[in-house]
């Protein structure tokens, strides 16, 4: 029997400063990019090699920004949500949703790491 | 894992024109910025030009006679270069990232792509 794929989802606030090459990621979405089915969201789809985003460490490839600086990315044309990233500052406030896949066992059976083990 | 394979290169006169094509692999082609890149024998890597999402930009070296285009539905890049010159001579490379830099609307920096393909040689006589 095959184990069922969930997904544990969270967010945070994450503040990064801007390094002498900026904040170091790459993006995808948009309204006119829509990256994930049915999600005009914009989502990081790169982390540059010792960027300050890759410094800091909790910025992953695949989290979704849902807001910089307090401003919401939702209905935002692809390069307008670039433009914003690019004008935000040198101290950027991202909040973001980090979504963990969690590999469930077998019904009837506990996963290796279940602690009531 | 995206795969880059350039063609078009060749032995030209000074004046006249080649078209580099770079075929890639990948469902979401039309999110990747690619940027092309050229190497001399004894030289860096130095920046062509690129494209994104949004738009395309060249080399100030470049500038007037190189042209960057995309077909989305083909997952090709394509380099036009007219009116080539001998300096012009070099190994051409495609590159590719996934996404927009949110630094750089343009990269040139080698190290904001992830991907090469195995590269052309082009050169003029």
């Known amino acids: 029997m095959n184990g069922r794929v969930d997904y544990l989802v969270t967010e945070e606030e994450i503040n990064l400063t801007r390094g002498p090459s900026g904040l170091g990621f790459n993006i995808v979405g948009g309204t006119d990019q829509q990256y994930v089915s049915n999600d005009s969201g914009i989502y990081v789809s790169r982390i540059k090699e010792n960027g300050a985003a890759a410094l800091d460490g909790r910025l992953q490839e695949g989290d979704k920004i849902l807001s910089v600086n307090g401003q919401d990315l939702k209905n935002l044309l692809h390069q307008d949500a670039v433009d914003l990233f690019r004008n935000a500052g040198y101290a950027v406030s991202l909040r973001v949703q980090h979504r963990l896949q969690v590999q469930n066992g077998p019904i009837g059976h506990r996963g290796e790491g279940d602690p009531s083990g | 894992e995206v795969q880059l394979v350039e063609s078009g290169g060749g032995l030209v006169q000074a004046g006249g024109s080649l078209r580099l094509s770079c075929a890639a692999s990948g469902r979401t082609f039309s999110t990747y910025t690619l940027g092309w890149f050229r190497q001399a024998p004894g030289k860096e890597r130095e920046f062509v030009g690129a494209i994104t999402w949004s738009g395309s930009s060249t080399a100030d070296s470049v500038k007037g006679r190189f042209t960057i285009s995309r077909d989305n539905a083909k997952n090709t890049v394509y380099l036009q270069m007219n009116s080539l010159k001998p300096e012009d001579t070099a190994v051409y490379y495609c590159?590719?990232?996934?996404?927009?830099?949110?630094?750089?609307?343009?990269?040139?920096?080698?190290?904001?792509?992830?991907?090469w393909g195995q590269g052309t040689q082009v050169t003029v006589s």
């Open positions: 590159a590719a990232a996934i996404g927009s830099s949110v630094d750089s609307y343009y990269p040139s920096d080698p190290l904001e792509y992830d991907y």
